[in-house]
């Protein structure tokens, strides 16, 4: 049962796992939510009636029942994490705490103008998790407008006190919006000879970089495979850092894989959740249910839907026992990793999917998908934008797609002809064309960025970057789509969708309603073959039904390509150019993005 | 109106190389892809490559890849194939196309063609 | 490559005929499919494309008919000038291919 409100004047008593210092019973909830073992929390806020060592402490907690013994006591904030919970989770955490001093290890001090400067440094310094900042009102001369940058082995401050004129924060990393280099690839052969700040069992390199990502400590990792010629060593999954923030030593190492910390992706925080299937693997821990099920993704969802389950292994029935049900084992661990994994025995194993809301914006679940028919409903595609031009009249000029709250990314070729961005207008939310009244509120463009290698679609490097004039407030209807990353390159997608207001055939008038085509993927070698008087590089990709009928059409130009991939939607392409529309067998080919996240970094966190 | 005006005949010696000509008029020569294809005597149509003068990319047939060389002159509106190390099966007409549609398709528009003969 | 096989390789008939030219493609290719006429000396010329469309200046008696592999050259009612090679080519996938032609002559 998920519940959100906080119990004032409440105790849970005993089921301690460990406590760390929050500025609030707020952030102590997130904590809680993001902790692998904690379902409850007391939070002890400032009251003079309680020992002020007392205050600021979040006591992480855990019950098998899923619930603890209430007692009053004053100052005493308790509730439930939100993994219970079905609604969309997020470490992010933009507020700014005044009078209080977070206390971590100062590893940098440095002048700043102001708390959000303070809190924008800490946010692009790789080491820190928090920050001090004290005011210009500060009575010590030579500490005002100091900006310490903190850091400590959870994530949390080791103490905080209250101290006037003086205000302290977290590191927006979690918010997606660090400028730091974000370092997708998987490095094979590879050991990181570094200091471990912890280590844990996982199956796969893949894994091992998730669980570094929400490590507070982790900047990169080593793991060793399955095939490590030290046995003990198999599977393990060492987290390290190092003062500089990268790997002072690389050692080629066979069997070992290496890669960093996706902390600092600002375009797409990894998913946190596991969704892989472990075929003849084992994971061992603590058991919480031996419960039996038809197969390996029912295992996943009663493991899914148990609170306290972390990871699981099925084993398949044996013949025709027990109505053809395999066994399906509910365990969990201390840290939510498995304390052995084990090879050969038979068995399937994965992980809950209960943490796959631990993401950013971009990853929030939307609307389901309505089956069928072309015509899409509000909502169902909220990153999808209409971009407008006013000269000389007002028309429907491309699509494009939401990345961040002041971006859109669309293609180049759709502003041939156009000088200037005071002409442009981009509407969100919008399903149908026919909302757009004149005092319908718009989005102003600031800036049209278009890629300088860009010459025509046909040739590539057909992208572009919108920079808005004002901020997008995220909403049901208007929120980003996630930018696919470097390490998903060789993934398969199943699901992608391509929508737009465009013709649906040649010659057609632009749609009132979003169109939407559910398309699948064809191999770039297939689509060379379909254009033999066009080079289709690596840096597009194709789609398109063999026996056409449903493709992207003129006025598509610029919209999104987007597939879903475990649970979460990608940016996958931009609409770029093809034949006609949906002519059978000649797919539509879009700009691929993957291959300009890079750029897009670049070009959205330049200063 | 559409017109593809190519080069005369020629006649070559076992080893040696051929240049034909192919003038476009009458269009965006850029728009279109201009597509080889040549004939031997009594024989049936073979497809050699295609170039796409918009962009100067080229296409070849697996079966002349090492020997066939497509080039366009976007100025001049002429495109050109060479053919080296010529030998006596290459004798043939050979014909420039411009395709139908901008992306491949049919081929609507033929030149006259050029008749190469090789003979030592 | 796709192979297009085209029958009969010759034909007889009069004027006034209904004649029909079959093409088999080795595998599917969809609707990209074109009939080109060609007469001794001459550059061929496209008749019809994506299988049934006509293409400009075209007379009616010429009509295209078939799907993924099998497709059909009709004429309806045969003139003195209809009497030359055809030839199918398919577009689907790239080299282009062309049948080995259908020499139409008169009875």
């Known amino acids: 049962e998920c519940v959100t409100q906080l119990l004032k004047d409440t105790c849970f008593e005993g089921g301690d796992i460990t406590t760390v210092f929050t500025p609030s019973a707020k952030y102590c909830q997130v904590v809680c939510t993001y902790h692998p073992r904690c379902l409850l929390f007391t939070f002890t806020a400032e009251s003079p009636s309680e020992d002020p060592t007392r205050w600021f402490t979040c006591v992480l907690k855990d019950s098998v029942t899923e619930t603890l013994p209430r007692v009053n006591r004053t100052a005493a904030i308790s509730g439930y994490s939100f993994k219970q919970c079905s609604h969309q989770i997020s470490a992010c955490n933009k507020d700014i705490y005044v009078d209080l001093d977070m206390k971590g290890i100062n590893y940098n001090s440095s002048v700043a103008k102001s708390a959000q400067e303070c809190q924008e440094r800490c946010t692009d310094d790789v080491h820190c998790h928090f920050f001090t900042y004290a005011t210009r009102q500060f009575p010590s001369l030579e500490h005002r407008n100091i900006c310490l940058l903190k850091h400590t082995q959870t994530g949390t401050p080791t103490r905080i006190t209250k101290l006037d004129k003086v205000v302290s924060g977290f590191s927006l990393k979690s918010c997606a919006l660090s400028n730091l280099a974000c370092i997708r690839d998987i490095f094979p052969n590879t050991v990181f000879a570094d200091s471990n700040i912890d280590s844990v069992m996982a199956p796969d390199a893949f894994v091992c970089g998730r669980i570094c990502t929400h490590h507070p400590g982790c900047l990169f990792f080593t793991f060793f495979s399955q095939e490590w010629p030290k046995e003990s060593q198999r599977n393990l999954c060492l987290l390290k850092t190092s003062e500089s923030g990268l790997p002072s030593t690389r050692i080629k190492k066979s069997k070992a894989l290496s890669g960093f910390s996706l902390q600092s992706c600002r375009h797409s925080i990894p998913v946190f959740c596991h969704s892989s299937f472990y075929h003849d693997t084992d994971f061992l821990g603590e058991e919480l249910d031996i419960v039996a099920a038809k197969s390996h993704e029912a295992c996943q969802k009663l493991c899914t839907n148990a609170v306290r389950c972390q990871f699981f292994t099925y084993t398949p029935a044996q013949a025709s026992c027990n109505e053809g049900k395999g066994k399906c084992y509910l365990k969990l661990s201390s840290n939510g990793s498995p304390t052995k994994i084990l090879h050969g025995r038979g068995g399937i194993s994965g992980y809950t999917l209960r943490l796959c809301k631990m993401d950013n914006e971009c990853t929030t679940k939307i609307k389901p998908r309505i089956v069928g028919g072309t015509a899409s409903v509000r909502g169902e595609w909220p990153w999808q934008v209409t971009l407008h031009t006013t000269s000389p009249t007002q028309r429907h000029l491309c699509g494009g797609s939401i990345i961040g709250n002041q971006w859109i990314l669309t293609a180049a070729h759709c502003f041939y002809g156009v000088e200037s961005p005071k002409i442009l207008r981009v509407y969100s939310g919008i399903l149908n064309q026919s909302e757009i009244k004149e005092d319908t509120s718009f989005f102003g463009v600031q800036e049209i960025i278009i890629h300088d290698q860009y010459k025509m679609a046909e040739s590539g490097y057909d992208i572009a970057l919108l920079k808005l004039e004002t901020t997008v407030n995220y909403t049901d209807s208007q929120r980003p789509i996630c930018l696919p990353s470097k390490g998903d390159r060789n993934v398969i997608y199943t699901d992608c969708w391509v929508t737009g207001w465009g013709y649906r055939k040649l010659r057609d008038k632009i749609q009132n309603t979003l169109q939407k085509a559910k398309i699948p993927l064809v191999t770039n070698e297939e689509c060379q073959k379909r254009y033999r008087g066009h080079k289709i590089t690596h840096k597009m990709i194709c789609a398109g039904y063999r026996e056409g009928g449903k493709d992207a059409c003129k006025g598509d130009s610029g919209g999104p390509l987007s597939c879903k991939h475990n649970e979460v939607w990608h940016l996958v392409g931009i609409t770029s150019w093809g034949e006609g529309c949906a002519q059978r067998e000649r797919p539509g080919v879009y700009t691929n993005v993957v291959e300009y996240v890079d750029w897009i970094l670049e070009k959205t966190q330049a200063v | 109106q559409v017109q593809l005006v190519q080069s005369g005949a020629e006649v070559k010696k076992p080893g040696s190389s051929v240049k034909v000509s192919c003038k476009a008029s009458g269009y965006a020569f850029s728009n279109y892809l201009i597509e080889w294809v040549r004939q031997a005597p009594g024989q049936g149509l073979e497809w050699m490559g295609v170039?796409?003068?918009?962009?100067?990319?080229?296409n070849y047939n697996e079966n002349f890849k090492d020997r066939v060389t497509i080039t366009a002159d976007e100025s001049t509106s002429t495109a050109y194939m060479e053919l080296s190390s010529l030998r006596s099966e290459d004798t043939a007409v050979y014909y420039c196309?411009?395709?139908?549609?901008?992306?491949?398709?049919?081929?609507?528009?033929w030149g006259q063609g050029t008749t190469v003969t090789v003979s030592s | 490559d796709i192979q297009m096989t085209q029958s009969p390789s010759f034909l007889s008939a009069s004027v006034g005929d209904r004649v029909t030219i079959t093409c088999k493609a080795s595998?599917?290719?969809?609707?990209?499919v074109a009939w080109y006429q060609q007469k001794p000396g001459k550059a061929p010329k496209l008749l019809i494309y994506?299988?049934?469309n006509r293409y400009t200046g075209v007379p009616s008696r010429f009509s295209g008919s078939g799907s993924g592999t099998d497709f059909t050259l009709t004429i309806s009612s045969l003139q003195p000038e209809d009497f030359a090679t055809y030839y199918c080519?398919?577009?689907?996938?790239?080299?282009?291919?062309f049948g080995q032609g259908t020499k139409l002559e008169i009875k």
């Open positions: 595998q599917s290719v969809s609707n990209d």
């Open positions: 170039i796409n003068p918009g962009s100067g990319y080229t």
């Open positions: 080519q398919q577009d689907y996938s790239s080299p282009p291919t």
């Open positions: 196309a411009r395709t139908y549609g901008k992306y491949g398709g049919a081929m609507d528009f």
């Open positions: 994506y299988i049934s």
